[in-house]
Interface confidence: medium
């Protein structure tokens, strides 16, 4: 089978596909499983070791424009007795994911994929000890 | 959906909303290039809830690797480097948004597809249930 | 255990073409991405272009523009790279290289080179 | 394109001794910057991801830090199997750039 050339996909397109401009792609932005709904825990975030706290920031031109954003709450972590043990970490667990944002040039707008970064939780770590030689 | 300002010298055409199909260029933009990836990526290790990398492949999907956290204890590692059952390892779940290949196998057309993964573990104080 | 295997060595006339081929295995090809990066006799590493074949696109050093060419074959898992317009210039070592483009322990861990090919000499002489 | 520049050029060090190699952005990259090692007459190998993270299977002498601009390599402990020539690259913004190199010999 003979390659195709750049800006085709390896493998048969099917005749079917949209027609799509050079240099962009596609994007349905009606999100597959929408409704499906996060199961953790409850509470985790106050009965960790490592509690954190939520803060919900938000951008007009990003889709979605809600993101939700994890703080520790301590430096270290909570040990049996309910105070903060500083010789443990509460160290934050970050997650990326793909957002959609919208550019204004003048009147016209165009839209880019783009990578954001979300600190979803917090764990608790044995710290890293660094011996000075 | 969600509405923005528009530039009031522009015809009014523009939905305010975002639209349901929209072309978008074709790099991903990385914001995070200042701290990417600031992780410490032993802390799966270093965790008192510790967690396996388990991998999700799936070729039809953007980024088709996934690689997912199961954490490794039901309890937590305490002091002594002890499971202890006292405590619970829970994982931290996250909704993210991929890209699907839509209609599969057209090359440059996709659809975002939200998908629970498991980032991490924490540990919790267990909820004790009193049987009256 | 990801593998790249190039093709063998070429020897060219100026002004000819080379396509030298990069077959992939162990890992999901259609997933990563391949760059090619050459080396000229005692010098560094030049990156010349790169495919996701997830998205079907190339990216090209504007050096290389219009004389390189990257394709892919998701059906035999093998990359190419077609370079045409070929002077003594162009005589190196190319390598073809994989990007994981994965989502590792909550990242996309991308844009760097995990796994190299052997290496393919060519030598353009008259 | 951004251009990388690494010093020193060459280092010839004694076995277990420190090396240290620096390689610096024209511009600011964040931390995509990447280190690989390349031994004579074989293809290069990923050493360290994004500045400062380690890569599975190499040794823990190996580390690296920095970000913006400028960027460390470390060999704590240098030992013969380590001479070769050593690579910077950053990948923040097309094209993707590699330093000059900076080769390393055993004494």
């Known amino acids: 089978r003979k390659i195709p050339k750049v800006g085709h996909t390896f493998f048969q397109k099917p005749e079917s596909c949209p027609p799509v401009p050079g240099g962009s792609m596609k994007l349905d932005i009606g999100i597959i499983n929408e409704n499906q709904r996060v199961s953790m825990s409850r509470n985790i975030e106050s009965r960790s070791t490592s509690p954190w706290n939520y803060t919900v920031t938000w951008d007009p031109n990003r889709y979605p424009s809600e993101v939700v954003q994890a703080q520790c709450r301590n430096l270290g972590c909570i040990n049996a007795q309910g105070k903060e043990d500083i010789s443990m970490n509460s160290v934050p667990i970050q997650q990326e994911t793909l957002v959609v944002r919208r550019k204004h040039q003048g009147c016209s707008v165009s839209f880019q994929l783009e990578k954001v970064l979300v600190t979803v939780g917090c764990t608790c770590v044995t710290p890293v000890i660094h011996h000075v030689q | 959906g969600i509405t923005i300002p528009r530039n009031p010298g522009c015809p009014n055409s523009e939905d305010k909303n975002f639209p349901r199909t929209v072309m978008v260029n074709l790099n991903i933009h990385n914001r995070n290039t200042n701290t990417n990836p600031k992780r410490s990526s032993d802390y799966y290790n270093r965790s008192t809830s510790p967690w396996n990398l388990h991998r999700n492949e799936d070729p039809e999907r953007y980024p088709s690797v996934i690689w997912e956290a199961k954490c490794r204890h039901l309890g937590c590692i305490n002091a002594d480097g002890n499971v202890d059952y006292h405590m619970n390892s829970v994982p931290i779940q996250q909704e993210i948004l991929v890209l699907r290949r839509e209609p599969p196998h057209c090359p440059n057309s996709f659809r975002l597809e939200k998908i629970l993964v498991s980032v991490g573990c924490t540990c919790v104080t267990p909820i004790v249930h009193h049987v009256a | 255990e990801v593998q790249l295997v190039q093709s063998g060595a070429e020897v060219k006339m100026p002004g000819s073409s080379l396509k030298i081929s990069c077959k992939a295995s162990?890992?999901?090809?259609?997933?990563?991405?391949i760059s090619w990066v050459r080396q000229a006799p005692g010098q560094g590493l030049e990156w010349m272009g790169g495919?996701?074949?997830?998205?079907?696109?190339?990216d090209y050093a504007q050096k290389f523009q219009g004389r390189v060419t990257i394709t892919a074959d998701e059906s035999t898992t093998t990359a190419y790279m077609e370079l045409s317009g070929l002077t003594s210039d162009d005589t190196a070592v190319y390598y073809c290289a994989r990007d994981p483009n994965e989502f590792w322990n909550g990242y996309y861990d991308t844009h760097h080179f995990d796994y190299w090919g052997q290496g393919t000499t060519v030598t353009v002489s008259s | 394109e951004i251009v990388l520049t690494q010093s020193p050029d060459f280092q010839s060090v004694t076995p277990k001794e420190k090396v240290t190699i620096t390689c610096r952005a024209s511009?600011?990259?964040?931390?995509?910057l990447h280190w690989y090692q390349q031994k004579p007459d074989q293809s290069p190998k990923l050493l360290i991801k994004?500045?400062?993270h380690s890569v599975s299977g190499v040794p823990s002498r190996f580390s690296g830090s920095g970000s913006g601009t400028d960027f460390t390599l470390t060999i704590n402990g240098l030992e013969a199997e380590d001479a070769g020539t050593y690579y910077c690259h950053q990948s923040d913004i097309l094209p993707h750039t590699f330093g000059p190199g900076t080769k390393v010999d055993i004494k």
């Open positions: 511009q600011d990259i964040g931390s995509a």
């Open positions: 162990g890992g999901s090809f259609r997933g990563y991405g």
């Open positions: 994004y500045a400062s």
């Open positions: 495919i996701t074949p997830f998205f079907g696109w190339a």
